[in-house]
């Protein structure tokens, strides 16, 4: 017998120092974009290797960014979205929802999975 | 993951006009930042013309400014690159390339190293 797959949802506040090349990362989503269905928020779609993202370690692909510098990312469009990274500043502050795949065991055994992306 | 073909490339003369093609495999095309890059026998690959996932941004790259236009069809899962007044120098090798999502940061979208797929390339020879 299977054990049935349960997401864990936590969230974190993430500063990061704008590099030499930016915060390094992509986004995806957005009112005119939905990444998850019945979602219209803005998701991590890609890490760049040595980006500032990477070097800090936290954020993941796959994680949902809910604010940048206090500003909340709902309802908005995706270039919207993208402009508001882009002129974040040099100190970016996100606070972000990292959702962790959790394999529930028949037994109630449980083993984190990898992040879902 | 998307695979890219481009098509259309040929030999023209100077002043005349082309369109290029990327037709683009995958459901989520209207996720992707599209762009055309080119390359030139000796020298580096060199950004030409990129846009966001909607279409709604674009740009391009100075040599080619006011000359060409990218567009993109999301239904069709196609983008497109209308050359002008074409020149000599711009004969090389056309590539069609793509990424995920948006990058968030200013510029990232001219850099070679942004894209993560990319097509085999069309010819343009402009005589």
């Known amino acids: 017998m299977n054990g049935r797959v349960d997401y864990l949802v936590t969230e974190e506040e993430i500063n990061l120092t704008r590099g030499p090349s930016g915060l390094g990362f992509n986004i995806v989503g957005g009112t005119d974009q939905q990444y998850v269905s019945n979602d219209s928020g803005i998701y991590v779609s890609r890490i760049k290797e040595n980006g500032a993202a990477a070097l800090d370690g936290r954020l993941q692909e796959g994680d949902k960014i809910l604010s940048v510098n206090g500003q909340d990312l709902k309802n908005l469009l995706h270039q919207d979205a993208v402009d508001l990274f882009r002129n974040a500043g040099y100190a970016v502050s996100l606070r972000v929802q990292h959702r962790l795949q959790v394999q529930n065991g028949p037994i109630g055994h449980r083993g984190e999975g990898d992040p879902s992306g | 993951q998307v695979q890219l073909v481009e098509s259309g490339g040929r030999l023209v003369q100077a002043g005349d006009s082309l369109k290029l093609s990327c037709a683009a495999s995958?459901?989520?095309?209207?996720?992707?930042?599209m762009g055309w890059f080119r390359q030139a026998p000796g020298k580096e690959r060199e950004f030409v013309a990129g846009?966001?996932?909607?279409?709604?941004?674009?740009y391009y790259g100075d040599s080619v400014k006011g000359r060409f236009s990218i567009s993109r069809d999301n239904a069709r899962n196609t983008v497109y690159l209308q050359m002008n007044s074409l020149k000599p120098e711009d004969t090389a090798v056309y590539f069609c390339?793509?990424?995920?999502?948006?990058?968030?940061?200013?510029?990232?979208?001219?850099?070679?190293?942004?894209?993560?797929?990319w097509g085999q390339g069309t010819q343009v020879t402009v005589s």
């Open positions: 846009t966001s996932p909607s279409g709604d941004n674009r």
């Open positions: 995958g459901r989520t095309f209207s996720t992707y930042t």
């Open positions: 390339a793509a990424f995920r999502g948006s990058c968030v940061d200013d510029g990232c979208d001219f850099r070679v190293s942004q894209y993560d797929y």
